[in-house]
Interface confidence: low
């Protein structure tokens, strides 16, 4: 309902660290909703009775929102189509000294190019 | 660089209310949401609620729901924290924290205001 | 609410030693999408806290491989493998899957 997380670099612990893409500071994403489920049903809210999703997402209960594909979020208003990693735009390739990188949904995918003079 | 700046120290008198501002840079403002923690000298840090700067929400610790509240001003990238019907158990250093609310909670702090509640 | 208990209080350690605190929290603290939100923050003498340990067991940007933390449910702990004078100050568990979110008490780990 919303709440799913999506694997997505961490300040300072990526999969595919390169400090040349990846300056210190995290890209700016946030990608983890933050409506925490109380263990007892839900906490009253001053929130219960706004509009809480966006982009076609259902509201439930009250305050939480089942998200349709691709997005998420507290409401809805994340959409992993559309995420970055860093200064690198989504669904875009990035060619990097010994490897060739992707940026897909906020991940930086690369793939080693053992072929290339001095990549060995 | 990330940088919180909070608002200077106050003193305040019971009944009144006080107002901490958190000036953020060095970031992308409406990305992360903005913690506030509170610390009674000599004690522990309280959680007294988040907001999400990008749509406003807030999340609220109920023990101070009713005397709290959280605003953004997104124009000049600063966050707010009011607190009324001030006590002298109020008496507090207050840190505003960003956090990207995925990973962890709060990664960067301010330095901290110290609200000093007196008669 | 969840009620983060730490121990011990107060922690002496000799240099070079290494040091233990556990927290404990009065209900399970795993998110409703599978994750546990169980962090680490010291708070040096006259600063702010800093982050060290996210997701129970993730160290943060910066952070010394000295510092690990583990557990899992309501039962977790950080281990320092060799206490260095820096690392004085108070240690603080905090759970970030429900609100309110909230802290232990925190350890004072002191220089023996």
């Known amino acids: 309902l919303g709440h799913q997380e999506f694997a997505r670099p961490s300040r300072g612990y990526l999969a595919f660290r390169d400090d040349s893409i990846w300056p210190q500071e995290e890209p700016a994403i946030r990608p983890r909703s933050s409506q925490r489920v109380p263990p007892m049903g839900i906490q009253h809210s001053k929130e219960l009775n706004r509009t809480c999703c966006l982009n076609g997402g259902t509201c439930m209960l009250g305050s939480f929102c089942a998200c349709p594909p691709s997005f998420y979020g507290r409401n809805c208003e994340h959409d992993v189509r559309k995420e970055n990693c860093g200064s690198v735009p989504h669904d875009t390739w990035l060619p990097k000294k010994c490897s060739l990188c992707k940026c897909w949904h906020g991940q930086l995918r690369c793939f080693p190019q053992a072929f290339l003079p001095g990549c060995d | 660089e990330v940088q919180l700046v909070e608002s200077g120290a106050e003193v305040k008198k019971p009944g009144a209310s006080v107002k901490v501002s958190c000036k953020a840079s060095g970031y992308t403002f409406t990305s992360y949401w903005i913690h506030w923690v509170r610390q009674a000298p000599g004690q522990g840090l309280e959680w007294m609620g988040e907001?999400?700067?990008?749509?406003?929400?807030?999340n609220y610790n109920e023990k101070f729901k009713n005397r709290v509240t959280l605003t953004v001003d997104t124009s000049i990238s600063t966050a707010y924290m009011e607190l009324s019907r001030l006590r002298s158990d109020d008496t507090a250093v207050y840190y505003c924290?960003?956090?990207?609310?995925?990973?962890?909670?709060?990664?960067?702090w301010g330095q901290g205001t110290m609200v000093t509640v007196s008669s | 609410d969840f009620v983060m208990t730490q121990s011990p209080l107060s922690l002496p350690v000799t240099p070079g030693e290494p040091a233990s605190i556990s927290c404990r929290s009065s209900?399970?603290?795993?998110?409703?999408?599978?994750?546990?939100?169980l962090e680490w923050y010291l708070q040096k003498p006259g600063q702010s806290p800093q982050l060290l340990i996210y997701k129970v067991s993730n160290r943060f940007s910066g952070v010394p491989d000295r510092f690990s933390g583990s557990g899992s449910g309501t039962d977790f702990t950080l281990k320092i493998s060799r206490v260095e004078a820096e690392d004085v100050g108070v240690y603080y568990c905090f759970q970030g899957s429900h609100v309110p979110l909230t802290f232990g008490a925190g350890t004072k780990l002191e220089i023996k």
């Open positions: 209900q399970s603290i795993v998110h409703s999408n599978g994750n546990t939100y």
């Open positions: 907001n999400d700067p990008s749509n406003g929400r807030t």
């Open positions: 924290a960003r956090g990207p609310n995925y990973f962890y909670s709060m990664d960067y």
